[in-house]
């Protein structure tokens, strides 16, 4: 069967939003009504991988484009970045490991660790208005806890 | 036994609030994705509010959104519906339900408390 | 969103008959389909999920089958204790939403 997709928003554990920001990078920033709109809706995919109660292997799409959340290495570093796919091919079952993340799910905190960089989390700054990015730490100055909307 | 009791519903007027209860037991509460679905008089099924296991992930149909919100408390194996602004619209049985959004279908059910909306 | 119909909204047949409930999706869930039986008075029972898997304690009796839009649910020889009403439920995507349901009756 082919991969189901589901769309949903993403708030930091500040209650950040996250919106575009140029082509290829979101950032996080506070939003209140009317503004929630410019919020990046995903289209979250649920994808082949090791999986449990707490971890389930997604793909995170943005909706109605054809980028993909990805990690790579850059100068060395693990790198979060937003990198366009051919949308004959996207979303698959099998997604190349680069895009995958276990979404995990423990005591109301929800995290997004890349598998292809174990112990690397999607994250955003305390500060507002800086880019979403791949961070190495967590419990630290930088977020790494979501909630997690889901929209229809 | 697995069981879910919902609690709470009663008789309310338009524009007030409720709020409902479900008491799970039989099976690890906290290891599992919970809905609220309701039931209009002989009408069919309606899944109005979802929380994950873990209270990070939520979904409300556009029928409720910003009216109702769902919560759980995993320590005391409780899931909650508040209902503000309530409308006539609201008015059926509502049922607790185990699942959600990841495995989909809900494969236990409360026996449902009763709203009714009404001046 | 997926709008779920069936068919027929009711039907009476007799004990030992073979009954068949049809649902149509309006675009293709993928198997991603349930079925649940509600009898009086009573809440949802699940008996299928992923278009053709019993679920636990559910009789034999009981069957689904279909692909992409459509889906049928069967029952191969019916007893007095199938009165119910019968619903399907898409999950391919949210909103997940039933059909407005079959009233089975025993003539």
């Known amino acids: 069967a082919p991969v189901r997709s589901l769309h949903c928003t993403l708030r930091d554990a500040q209650l950040k939003s996250l919106v575009m920001s140029g082509p290829y990078e979101l950032k996080a920033l506070h939003l209140q009504g009317q503004d929630l709109e410019q919020q990046v809706v995903f289209s979250m995919s649920f994808v082949q991988g090791e999986e449990s109660n707490d971890k389930i292997p997604v793909a995170l799409g943005l909706k109605a484009k054809n980028l993909y959340l990805s990690c790579v290495l850059k100068d060395d570093k693990p790198t979060l970045q937003l990198e366009s796919v051919d949308p004959k091919n996207y979303p698959k079952k099998k997604m190349e490991k680069r895009f995958v993340f276990n979404k995990i799910e423990i005591n109301n905190k929800l995290e997004f660790e890349s598998a292809q960089f174990p112990n690397w989390y999607i994250s955003t700054s305390q500060a507002e208005s800086m880019p979403v990015f791949l961070g190495g730490t967590r419990g630290g100055q930088d977020i790494t806890d979501f909630t997690m909307q889901f929209v229809s | 036994e697995v069981q879910l009791v919902e609690s709470g519903g009663g008789v309310v007027q338009p524009g007030r609030s409720l709020r409902l209860s479900c008491s799970a037991s039989?099976?690890?509460?906290?290891?599992?994705?919970m809905s609220w679905v309701r039931q209009a008089p002989g009408k069919g099924l309606e899944w109005v509010a979802y929380?994950?296991?873990?209270?990070?992930?939520?979904y409300y149909p556009d029928s409720v959104k910003g009216r109702f919100t769902i919560s759980r408390d995993n320590s005391k194996n409780t899931l909650f519906l508040q209902m503000d602004s309530l409308r006539a619209e609201d008015t059926a049985v509502y049922y607790c339900?185990?699942?959600?959004?990841?495995?989909?279908?809900?494969?236990?059910w409360g026996q449902g408390t009763p709203v009714t909306v009404s001046s | 969103d997926i709008q779920m119909t069936q068919s027929p909204s009711s039907l009476s047949a007799s004990v030992g008959d073979r009954v068949t409930i049809t649902c149509r999706a309006s675009?293709?869930?993928?198997?991603?389909l349930t079925w649940y039986q509600q009898t009086p008075g009573k809440a949802p029972k699940l008996l299928i999920y992923n278009a053709k898997t019993l679920a636990d304690g559910v009789p034999s009796r009981f069957s689904g089958s279909g692909s992409g839009t459509d889906y049928t649910f069967t029952i191969s020889s019916l007893q007095p204790e199938d009165i119910a009403t019968y619903y399907c439920?898409?999950?391919?995507?949210?909103?997940?939403?039933f059909g407005q349901g079959t009233k089975l009756q025993i003539t």
């Open positions: 339900a185990r699942g959600g959004v990841y495995k989909g279908y809900f494969d236990v």
């Open positions: 039989g099976f690890i509460f906290s290891r599992y994705d």
């Open positions: 439920q898409h999950f391919w995507s949210i909103p997940y939403t």
């Open positions: 675009g293709n869930i993928h198997n991603y």
């Open positions: 929380i994950s296991h873990g209270g990070a992930g939520t």
